[in-house]
Amino acid sequence: DGCKDIFMKNEILSASQPFAFNCTFPPITSGEVSVTWYKNSSKIPVSKIIQSRIHQDETWILFLPMEWGDSGVYQCVIKGRDSCHRIHVNLTVFEKHWCDTSIGGLPNLSDEYKQILHLGKDDSLTCHLHFPKSCVLGPIKWYKDCNEIKGERFTVLETRLLVSNVSAEDRGNYACQAILTHSGKQYEVLNGITVSITERAGYGGSVPKIIYPKNHSIEVQLGTTLIVDCNVTDTKDNTNLRCWRVNNTLVDDYYDESKRIREGVETHVSFREHNLYTVNITFLEVKMEDYGLPFMCHAGVSTAYIILQLPAPDFRAY
């Protein structure tokens, strides 16, 4: 069908609550495109009828709510005037008790589930709520170990819980809860967050911290399109540069002629005491020469790499 395949990271979510995923691929979706969602390679698109439990809402796929049987690979097909890209998203649904935030045993946990507070500082936790405009979110309540959080040190500000003068006792299992309204119906959204405390000031003075990647290999099929984010936390006043390099050369320079591998535009989210930066690397088409080569994310003096690896052959197919 001529569509390029792009494989996104797994998303792990809990059953019986709303979930939404936005089909965005900045090099493509910035222009005039059409987006269509499918499940498990089905030829029939996901419904656009807003009364359907699972439906497409503009570029989003929306589950109201997510159910146990919704696990699987979803594809969104982005068609432009001269291009077609198919983005694969693997959704894994798990059962979760309302106050159960200990999901550390699950693979590929998003950093939204694991947050850090800095000892002795004023810091904050963020309730990550990603939904289309059709969803209206009510005020957020915060819990720790299944009990509502209160006290003069805690302030709820929009999607954040501000914690003043962080102490060692603030570690533990938190949850944030909001009521989502869609087409007159109400749903409860609950996100679990495991919080650890670090004694380092800010994010280690001027030394940025690369959250992802973690010096590891990624299995990827030959010929596919791949996007890898480099996520970096750094102080607000930092002057560090963030970039992707290969063979000690900026990827944009190294692949200047073919432009087959490019660095994306850096974005950042501002928190109270630090910034979270994201800069991606896009492999438009993975070639044999890419395997075994360390692609380095640099952030100031910090570095982390990924190495592309061919998937192990599946002998069950023979």
Partner: antibody, heavy 116, light 107 residues
Amino acid sequence: QVQLVQSGAEVKKPGASVKVSCKVSGYFFTSYWMNWVNQAPGQGLEWMGMIHPYDSETRLAQKFKGRVTMTVDKSTSTVYMELSSLRSEDTAVYYCASSTTAFAYWGQGTLVTVSS
Amino acid sequence: DIQMTQSPSSLSASVGDRVTITCRASQDIGNALNWLQQKPGKAPKRLIYATSSLDPGVPSRFSGSRSGTDYTLTISSLQPEDFATYYCLQYASSPYTFGQGTKVEIK
């Protein structure tokens, strides 16, 4: 260092009341719930209820509603548990336990003996 | 109320033995379960928080796990100082409830 220091042992007559204190140091007193747990001689642990020092919200086990009062003195970072209409089966060790994270720290216990 | 059924109520074991204690919750409590150790005349001490998180200073021979509504405390190699009574505690919803306790004695 977190410490929960409880008041000393008490001997009471049936029908009387007892007030046990639990003084907290080493963490932000008004940020976390405080639980009370009892243990009769040779028996297991039983949750009585909890109080939040910030606003004195209290939750009690059904068995203790009407007989237990939990209070807070923010100025001294102390929580109190008062048990009224004492009977012989209330003879037990009473513990306070903080929920900085669930039941992380415990007081040393206060033995209350109810005897005529 | 959520009932916690703990077994066995007592067990005899030797130093070096592997010991397992189980608690079954009458309904879903997620991972909101602690394991406590109590020695005679002393206050309980938390060993494990949130099903499997070891408290600071607790030896690594202690571990906690979960399968559905069954929760297990394992002592991989029993030491002389481990002879005590162990309790599970659910804090998913009040009233919080304890297991009946397991007394670990010297064989």
